[in-house]
């Protein structure tokens, strides 16, 4: 393990979808990989008239965009299907929503996830 | 190292069925869901379907549903994909693909393609 | 189903030139993207998941970009053997898409 780094052995797992992609509704995921890899753990989520939609969350493979994120944050602003990653065991059990916007002081949405 | 190996090309005649074998090596095997690919000549790539090899179950393409038939056998490691009553349109180079565990799931093996020939 | 629209249909260009291609989901994929190169009379190969992510072994000067709807793979200097056709993917969702391909032609 390198030191400061948080290694991802397990994540929170749901799948909207999961009767047509033939996988299971919710669980935990766990994660494995080359030792030379990083895993990640992710959430994608809608936003549908103020009520947020779990798409999925899980396991994510090796990305620099997810490096030495101990909290699974979105930045964008107002994506239609939002997305975040992180590292550490079971990170994508919460989730938020900070936009970074250049001009206004970003303001805070967290999400705490409740599957159907 | 991680190889996917496809069964060689084929010539059936309209309304006749196809079976294209893939055998994988070097993983295992159960650990990852294998799709279908297809690509007719000097065309794009289209999606078929998938197998999870663990307990065979299956998703297709509504195009191909009821025409094609995805079946594994864990004792060699090996897929099928066998597909019914062919039209000339099904003349094309069929492809098995190995997905990744985990999201985003792109296809990273690939088998070199099977080219099914449709002809009267 | 989600339409992949790949833009231009063909590019005309020369050793050590930027090439960019661009990739269009008919809504949002996140970034459930990938992009695999095709040679004539071999399999694709994966260059690029999650929008940005270098697959093993695919040389530096590959790169992709996006999230959303709207996605850029890019070779920064182009090289003999990058002659090739270039598929988008979306795995968002079932059924999985390609884009129509974009071959890239020595001018």
């Known amino acids: 393990a390198i030191l400061g780094r948080s290694e991802t052995q397990e994540c929170l797992f749901f799948n909207a979808n999961w009767e047509k992609d033939r996988t299971n509704q919710t669980g935990v995921e766990p994660c494995y990989g080359d030792k030379d890899k990083r895993r990640h753990c992710f959430a994608t989520w809608k936003n549908i008239s103020g009520s947020i939609e779990i798409v999925k969350q899980g396991c994510w493979l090796d990305d620099i965009n997810c490096y030495d994120r101990t909290d699974c944050v979105e930045k964008k602003d107002s994506p239609e299907v939002y997305f975040c990653c992180c590292e550490g065991n079971m990170c994508n059990e919460k989730f938020s929503y900070f936009p970074e916007m250049e001009v206004t002081q970003p303001t805070s949405n967290p999400v705490t996830p409740k599957p159907p | 190292q991680v190889q996917l190996v496809q069964s060689g090309a084929e010539v059936k005649k309209p309304g006749a069925s196809v079976k294209v074998s893939c055998k994988a090596s070097?993983?295992?095997?159960?650990?990852?869901?294998m799709h279908w690919v297809r690509q007719a000549p000097g065309q794009g790539l289209e999606w078929m379907g998938f197998?999870?090899?663990?307990?065979?179950?299956?998703s297709y393409a509504q195009k191909f549903q009821g025409r094609v038939t995805m079946t594994r056998d864990t004792s060699t490691s090996t897929v099928y994909m066998e597909l019914s009553s062919l039209r000339s349109e099904d003349t094309a180079v069929y492809y098995c693909?190995?997905?990744?565990?985990?999201?985003?799931?792109?296809?990273?093996?690939w088998g070199q393609g099977t080219t099914v020939t449709v002809s009267s | 189903d989600i339409q992949m629209t790949q833009s231009p249909s063909s590019v005309s260009a020369s050793v050590g030139d930027r090439v960019t291609i661009t990739c269009r989901a008919s809504q949002g994929i996140s970034r459930w993207l990938a992009w695999y190169q095709q040679k004539p009379g071999k399999a694709p190969k994966l260059l690029i998941y999650a929008a940005s992510s270098l697959q093993s072994g695919v040389p530096s000067r590959f790169s992709g970009s996006g999230s959303g709807t709207d996605f850029t793979l890019t070779i920064s200097s182009l090289q003999p053997e990058d002659f090739a056709t270039y598929y988008c993917q979306q795995a968002f969702s079932h059924p999985w898409t390609f884009g129509g391909g974009t071959k890239v032609e020595i001018k």
């Open positions: 070097g993983y295992t095997f159960t650990s990852y869901r």
């Open positions: 693909a190995r997905v990744s565990r985990y999201a985003p799931e792109p296809m990273d093996v």
């Open positions: 197998i999870v090899p663990s307990g065979g179950s299956t």
